[in-house]
Interface confidence: medium
Amino acid sequence: SKEPLRPRCRPINATLAVEKEGCPVCITVNTTICAGYCPTMTRVLQGVLPALPQVVCNYRDVRFESIRLPGCPRGVNPVVSYAVALSCQCALCRRSTTDCGGPKDHPLTCDDPRFQDSSSSKAPPPSLPSPSRLPGPSDTPILPQ
Amino acid sequence: APDVQDCPECTLQENPFFSQPGAPILQCMGCCFSRAYPTPLRSKKTMLVQKNVTSESTCCVAKSYNRVTVMGGFKVENHTACHCSTCYYHKS
């Protein structure tokens, strides 16, 4: 079936930076994050707070994978783990674990990747668009449904 | 049938309960983009309280509206334009 115009919140392929305090190297890994569209609405009623809760795209089930960072000094554990989204959901943003906000302007990939992860046999997916603006549907790579 | 994974656009909809014949009350509803991903180390360093996940979101909100009084004498915002913008009520 044709690719949806506004795909629902789901796991998408992404290229992320993996680094660690004390290690000189930043490497790029292929993983999945959660992205897509969630339904919201605005109240018409006056003088009432809070408004209807607004759900946003969040992790649901996550697997953690580990990777070894090269070049870490002695005494620094070179193993670092990163999240792989297995499933996603439209839900309230959990403040306890999540920085909840609007579009950010930080890059998700290494500024100067000195090593490219080659542990994945598949071709690396397109990296995330610059998060200085939220991508529209045409920007959003999706996993096969 | 449309793809079941598609999400309807953020648009004006007529509220069936507050509308009267000839006097529709319009309300913004629909879908907006958001994403969640592991917080990059560089961002974590700037956080007072470190969070493992970063969420970037937009929500369907009124871009413009008129305040009107409907039957029963209560006030509502009759939305006139919608867009995907800042979420205010998305945290738990």
Epitope: P39, L45, G47 | V4
Partner: antibody, heavy 118, light 111 residues
Framework: EVQLQQSGPELVKPGASVKISCKAS????????MHWVKQSHGRSLEWIGY????????GYNQRFNSKATLTVDNSSSTAFMEVRSLTSEDSAVYYC???????????WGQGTSVTVSS | DIVLTQSPASLAVSLGQRATVSCRAS??????????MNWFQQKPGQPPKLLIY???IQGSGVPARFSGSGSGTDFSLNIHPMEEDDTAMYFC?????????FGGGTKLEIK
């Protein structure tokens, strides 16, 4: 956790009235429309009407205009429905339901059974 | 009032198989890109539970095996794979116009 707790079953005589309550908890009562739905003999569902607790306006299905009256007591976060001039046709389970996103009825009370019998 | 006609009235499906319930509206329930069609599940002695809204959006906590599709006047609810716990009555509901109306219900059982 959102909960709607309805009053117990009622056995009433034809011609009498009955007032059913629906106590809300786990959310701000005045922020959401409350709907009432009738279910006869375990099958068909009929919308009776709604009330907006914050300022009290109501809307009714024309079929129930002179049959049901919806009210609220915001101090106790309770919605009420009075059904009058009862006949055997009014024997049913009555539900209250909160209105959520996209006008859905997202949380329901457990239902109140009303039996009209002489 | 908008009349909703559900079919079939009853349906028996084997565990693990697909169950499809249909709902036809007497007029379109679409408005500006949104189909105001909802689906509810009701088990004996319990209130209805919201499964799907806006034709295809899953309600909170609803398992992924429930999906909805359709637009205009023709809608369907799919359950796949069918589980023991899915034995229930299923109702469609339109909320485009007042009064909101419900379909007559489909009784789903295990074959």
């Amino acid at each position: 956790e959102v909960q709607l707790q309805q009053s117990g079953p009622e056995l009433v005589k034809p011609g009498a009235s009955v007032k059913i309550s629906c106590k809300a908890s786990g959310y701000t009562f005045t922020d959401y429309n409350m709907h009432w739905v009738k279910q006869s003999h375990g099958r068909s569902l009929e919308w009776i009407g709604y009330i907006y607790p914050y300022s009290g306006p109501t809307g009714y299905n024309q079929r129930f205009n002179s049959k049901a009256t919806l009210t609220v007591d915001n101090s106790s976060s309770t919605a009420f429905m009075e059904v009058r001039s009862l006949t055997s046709e009014d024997s049913a389970v009555y539900y209250c339901a909160r209105e959520g996103i996209f006008y859905t009825m997202d949380y329901w009370g457990q239902g109140t059974s009303v039996t009209v019998s002489s | 009032d908008i009349v909703l006609t559900q079919s079939p009235a009853s349906l028996a499906v084997s565990l693990g198989q697909r169950a499809t319930v249909s709902c036809r509206a007497s007029e379109s329930v679409d408005n500006n890109g949104i189909s105001f069609m909802n689906w509810f599940q009701q088990k004996p002695g319990q209130p209805p539970k919201l499964l799907i809204y806006a034709a295809s959006i899953q309600g909170s906590g609803v398992p992924a095996r429930f999906s909805g599709s359709g637009s205009g006047t023709d809608f369907s609810l799919n359950i796949h794979p069918m589980e023991e716990d899915d034995t229930a009555m299923y109702f469609c509901q339109q909320i485009k116009e007042v009064p909101p109306t419900f379909g007559g219900g489909t009784k789903l059982e295990i074959k």
